[in-house]
């Protein structure tokens, strides 16, 4: 069928904010707040970092990630790969939806130089009714977390 | 009442662009172009360099900002803070929504060195009827402005 | 008349995604994948390049490009430009909608080293039947093309 | 101007269930948190949950788990909070109030329930 | 979620400073700029006097100002008044969706 807006319905939405808790440093993905401060859910439920859709459409996702850090860490990639990628039950793997490659490390011209960069994604999607999307960054060790403003992860659909 | 958007009504929009005035030098937020060229308002009014919310509900609110320079100016800070932010009556000071911080000086590896950056932030926020939301890039002095493509300010109703 | 989005109609919409063929070194805009992958046109049109509006009103448009290198190649301009342009049958030029630039090549320290950057774009425009959106990257050597996730271009009505 | 006002005290008795309303007016309802939080009788203010009144979605501190419903009707712009197996330590006021961003601005005047046999 | 650590009582004269402290961890106040402050009168609800840990709600006289260290925010309120004389409450966001607030400090003017 092909997708529709209805003005009687609420049409979906979503902003999750970074908080403390969002690295892991597990390997899975950023994890977000969903209720408290500027983060919300409308139409749209989460799941261990996942915004879960509820509706098929088509959705304009996005995310933004603060990255910063003084000199380069011994041991660092030179690229931060920070992308958006959807998670469906008919594959076992998740599939990449938008993507960016950066090496912010190269700005700063002594090992001692704080830096800062940040990175934005955005884009159009088609989604189906309990599929996923996350965030991930490697290295997330440059993700710099302050207050839900400078790294955040929404959704609304078009 | 649940937010809906009713098919008789018109979807809240606007996009304004950078002008020679848009940088002030007085530590308020960036003033825009609202009507000529590309610019254009409707169903927001504006006041002061700030978008005004008529209607209540959830927006995608958007700024890019043009950064350039030749080397660094002597006493910059190393970083760049550009954000969204939000005046609401009962709260004087401004609410962060959305902030970037870049340190694009530090790619110019020489004091004579031509730079460009740009500076990209998107998100939807929730803005009651008479809120405003202003954009500020601290420091403002490299911000370039041309013919209101590079550096720009809008929303729309999601 | 004032655009209105009747609740019987399917939203214009689209995502296009960078491929091999995108970059044609003939000085002509960015070429796109309309139908594999990621990418679909909905209401929205494509010819060599462009998104062909068939229904007037606002858009939020986008593009991202993927940038990269290895140190910069010599006659490399300093600037690289990225932009969003409109074509009407009006005019015989194209007009800027939204444009960045950036200097990334000034991240690499030394000639050999591999650095990354992108570039995201996205405003709100109006656009008339018939006329169409193209982008344009100055130069197109340095855009980095990967399965359609890191380069892309899109638009919906708002 | 943004208002919370709540329901009138009540007496129970023990084992009994009381059920406090608070109703909105002067901003969208359905898009920020409610929450609850009481204070007995000389005691320091105690968070028991939170609504989202857009979603319905809930949270409870683990203190009151069990025990404590929050609901809400959006169409009255009405939050409500249930507490079932009164104890006389519920004898408390109880307010509601209002999450913006990170703060609770504005509060309700306060429900007194007293709990007696 | 454990309480913020608040001292029970703090007092001063008219015309004196005092300052109310509130201890958390780096899970909550520590790890956030979310620190909120409530002054409540007796049979009163509470009224918010201070978000983002020093910014002040119109209304609010500038008498009262906040500020944080560390793990550690603090209220202050210079030139003491008689209606100042009431409880004050420290609150913070902690993370993962929760809240906690502190144990409450009764502010005698002498």
């Known amino acids: 069928l092909i997708q529709e807006r209805r003005s009687h319905e609420v049409n979906p939405a979503a902003h999750l904010t970074g908080a403390n808790s969002s690295l892991t440093g597990s390997g899975g993905p950023l994890l977000w707040e969903t209720q408290l401060g500027l983060a919300f859910l409308r139409g749209l439920s989460y799941h261990d970092g996942a915004l879960v859709v509820t509706k098929a459409g088509y959705y304009y996702i996005y995310s933004k990630v603060q990255l910063g850090g003084v000199g380069c860490p011994l041991g660092l990639a030179s690229t931060i790969t920070h992308g958006l990628y959807k998670r469906t039950p008919r594959y076992p793997e998740e599939l990449e939806l938008l993507v960016s490659q950066q090496s912010p490390c190269g700005r700063a011209t002594s090992s001692s130089r704080v830096w800062w960069d940040s990175s934005f994604l955005g884009g159009v999607v088609h989604l189906e009714a309990g599929e996923e999307v996350v965030v991930r960054v490697l290295d997330e060790r440059l993700v710099r977390l302050r207050d839900g403003t400078r790294s955040y992860f929404g959704a609304f659909m078009v | 009442l649940i937010q809906e958007r009713r098919s008789h009504e018109v979807n809240p929009a606007a996009h304004l662009t950078g002008a020679n005035s848009s940088l002030t030098g007085s530590g308020g937020p960036l003033l825009w172009e609202t009507q000529l060229g590309l610019a254009f308002l409707r169903g927001l009014s504006y006041h002061d360099g700030a978008l005004v919310v008529t209607k209540a509900g959830y927006y995608y609110i958007y700024s890019k900002v043009q950064l350039g320079g030749v080397g660094c100016p002597l006493g910059l800070a190393s970083t760049i803070t550009h954000g969204l932010y939000k005046r609401t009556p009962r709260y004087p000071e401004e609410l962060e929504l959305l902030v970037s911080q870049q340190s694009p000086c530090g790619r110019a590896t020489s004091s004579s060195r031509v730079w460009w950056d740009s500076s990209f932030l998107g998100g939807v926020v929730h803005l009651e009827a008479g809120e405003e939301v202003v954009v500020r890039v601290l420091d403002e002095r490299l911000v370039r402005l041309r013919d209101g493509t590079r550096s720009y300010f809008g929303a729309f109703m999601v | 008349l004032i655009q209105e989005r009747r609740s019987h109609e399917v939203n214009p919409a689209a995502h296009l995604t960078g491929a091999n063929s995108s970059l044609t070194g003939s000085g002509g805009p960015l070429l796109w994948e309309t139908q594999l992958g990621l990418a679909f046109l909905r209401g929205l049109s494509y010819h060599d390049g462009a998104l062909v509006v068939t229904k007037a009103g606002y858009y939020y448009i986008y593009s991202k490009v993927q940038l990269g290198g290895v140190g910069c190649p010599l006659g490399l301009a300093s600037t690289i430009t990225h932009g969003l342009y409109k074509r009407t049958p009006r005019y015989p030029e194209e007009l800027e909608l939204l444009v960045s630039q950036q200097s990334p090549c000034g991240r690499a320290t030394s000639s050999s080293r591999v650095w990354w950057d992108s570039s995201f774009l996205g405003g709100v425009v109006h656009l008339e039947a018939g006329e169409e959106v193209v982008v344009r990257v100055l130069d197109e050597r340095l855009v980095r093309l990967r399965d359609g996730t890191r380069s892309y271009f899109g638009a919906f009505m708002v | 101007q943004v208002q919370l006002v709540q329901s009138g005290a009540e007496v129970k008795k023990p084992g009994a269930s009381v059920k406090v309303s608070c109703r909105a007016s002067?901003?969208?309802?359905?898009?920020?948190?409610m929450h609850w939080v009481r204070q007995a009788p000389g005691q320091r203010l105690e968070w028991m949950g939170w609504?989202?009144?857009?979603?319905?979605?809930?949270k409870y501190s683990q203190k009151f788990q069990g025990r404590v419903t929050i609901t809400r009707d959006t169409s009255a712009s009405t939050a409500y909070m249930e507490l079932s197996g009164l104890r006389s330590e519920d004898t408390a006021v109880y307010y509601c109030?209002?999450?913006?961003?990170?703060?609770?601005?504005?509060w309700g005047q306060g429900t007194l329930v007293t709990v007696s046999s | 979620q454990s309480a913020l650590t608040q001292p029970a009582s703090v007092s001063g004269s008219p015309g004196q400073s005092i300052t109310i402290s509130c201890t958390g961890t780096?899970?909550?106040?520590?790890?956030?700029?979310?620190v909120s402050w409530y002054q409540q009168h007796p049979g009163k609800a509470p009224k918010l006097m201070i978000y983002?840990?020093?910014k002040r709600p119109s209304g609010v006289s500038n008498r009262f100002s906040g500020s944080k260290s560390g793990n550690t925010a603090s209220l202050t309120i210079s030139g003491l008044q008689a209606e100042d004389e009431a409880d004050y409450y420290c609150?913070?966001?902690?993370?993962?969706?929760?809240?906690?607030f502190g144990g409450g400090t009764k502010l005698t003017v002498l």
């Open positions: 002067g901003y969208t309802f359905t898009s920020y948190l």
């Open positions: 109030a209002r999450n913006y961003y990170n703060w609770f601005d504005p």
């Open positions: 780096s899970s909550d106040v520590g790890g956030y700029n979310y």
């Open positions: 983002d840990v020093s």
């Open positions: 609504i989202n009144v857009g979603n319905g979605n809930t």
């Open positions: 609150f913070s966001y902690a993370g993962s969706s929760t809240v906690v």
